[in-house]
């Protein structure tokens, strides 16, 4: 059985079927003879009793007040009364967005971590027997899914899954076609157990060198296990036999991440090694970070401000 409407403040969209179900329903069945009444109050009108004659759009059942459909002028306070039991709701009916398949104010937001299980199931237990078909839309584009009674998405989340998913149930009542829309705003976030990798130290490093000597450029990063760290240089000039990447070293941090170090060794420094960028990059699925080294002849040191130097 559909659970009762316990929330005291409810916002709904005009033009959709809607119901209020009071929370002493089981008790009401026991006391069949007890007088049960539904009331509405809004603005100037105080406690007007509702009955099917009040409006052709309203239907009353034992426990439920149904709207076929709910309209803007249904905004107000609703009361269910039975003996000493009273339940009150404040209903706010908002305007439908005519330019979209959903109304922004009626969206449920969900955050899903990338690679984690992601599920959307289009169900509506209260109207289940009246639903002819159900469609699932992503950003207002219909998704072609096998099951047109209860369309479902079950997968491991990817960043491309982010968007607005709208379940639209189509149903008939008294010869009229209605639809009920439930929209989820799905945001896919980076796996929270992963960090965005970062290179340690300044982003630009001028290194004072002497021609004919060797230099070791150390690139250190904090990264995840599957991330990569590499040097990039000489894109246009082809390979330089004097430049060597040393073996990557890693140490695990107490938090379970990795501290990596990768050295670029430049032997017998020549003119061609000066004033060019040696870039070290750390890359992951969550982003990249790059730092650059420029070799400068020691004699030219005076031309560069002291704070940019790495010795």
């Amino acid at each position: 059985a559909e659970s009762c409407t316990s929330r005291p403040h409810i916002t709904v969209v005009e033009g959709e079927p809607f119901y209020l179900k009071h929370c002493s329903c089981s008790l009401a069945h026991e006391i069949e003879t007890t007088t049960k009444s539904w009331y509405k109050s809004s603005g100037s009108q105080e406690h007007v009793e509702l009955n099917p004659r009040s409006s052709s759009r309203i239907a009353l059942h034992d426990c439920v007040l149904e709207f076929w459909p709910v309209e803007l002028n249904d905004t107000g306070s609703y009361f269910f009364q039975m003996k000493n039991y009273t339940q009150k709701w404040k209903l706010n009916v908002i305007r439908r967005n005519k330019h979209s398949c959903f109304t922004e104010r009626q969206v449920t937001s969900k955050i899903v971590e990338v690679k984690k299980f992601f599920q959307i199931t289009c169900e509506n237990s209260y109207y289940q027997t009246l639903v002819n078909s159900t469609s699932l839309y992503k950003n207002c584009k219909k998704l072609l899914l096998e099951n047109n009674k209860n369309p479902t998405i079950k997968k491991n989340a990817e960043f491309e899954d982010q968007g607005y998913y709208s379940c639209v149930h189509f149903l008939h009542h008294n010869g009229k076609l209605f639809n009920i829309t439930k929209t989820f705003n799905i945001t896919i976030v980076e796996d929270r157990s992963n960090i965005v990798p970062v290179l340690l130290g300044p982003k630009l490093n001028h290194v004072a060198v002497e021609l004919g000597k060797n230099v070791r450029l150390n690139c250190s990063a904090l990264l995840n296990e599957e991330d990569v760290i590499y040097w990039m240089f000489g894109e246009e000039n082809g390979s330089d036999p004097n430049i060597h990447e040393e073996k990557e070293m890693r140490i695990m941090t107490p938090e379970g991440k990795w501290h990596a170090s990768k050295v670029l060794r430049i032997e017998n420094i020549g003119e061609s090694n000066l004033n060019v960028l040696y870039n070290c990059t750390v890359a992951s699925t969550g982003g990249t970070d790059t730092k650059s080294f420029i070799l400068v002849r020691k004699a030219d040191m005076a031309d560069i401000p002291g704070h940019v130097f790495t010795r």
Epitope: V228, E235, E236, T281, A283, S284, T285
Partner: nanobody, 114 residues
Framework: EVQLVESGGGLVQAGGSLRLSCAVS????????MAWFRQAQGKWRELVAR???????NYADSVKGRFAISRDNAKNTLYLQMNSLKPDDSAVYYC????????WGQGTQVTVSS
């Protein structure tokens, strides 16, 4: 959803050759600088060869003169021609892009016996 499917690995004698392929789907392949990485047992994933969007290749020291990276933008495929293979080249080979990575594929195992 970007998918990377590497293939072409296998068992080969030292001195032999293999050609690896990487089929990329779900993204604009031609806009990405691409690379081959490898991970040997007990070691970290390392960059082996990369190729810019304009087709300029670059290689790690250990494979220079033996490996050749290429790309076919029409087929959304990256290749790695590996010649004069050595036992040290034994690893799982992965392709990915330069920059923010796509999710890694399964890789393809290359085993070079002496």
């Amino acid at each position: 959803e970007v998918q990377l499917v590497e293939s072409g690995g296998g068992l080969v004698q030292a001195g032999g050759s293999l050609r690896l392929s990487c089929a990329v789907s779900g993204s604009t392949f031609s806009d990405a600088g691409m690379a081959w990485f490898r991970q040997a047992q007990g070691k970290w994933r390392e960059l082996v060869a990369r190729i810019s969007t304009s087709g300029i290749p670059n290689y790690a020291d250990s494979v220079k003169g033996r490996f050749a990276i290429s790309r076919d933008n029409a087929k959304n495929t990256l290749y790695l021609q590996m010649n004069s293979l050595k036992p040290d080249d034994s690893a799982v080979y992965y392709c990915n892009k330069i920059g923010t990575l796509w999710y890694w594929g399964q890789g393809t195992q290359v085993t070079v016996s002496s």
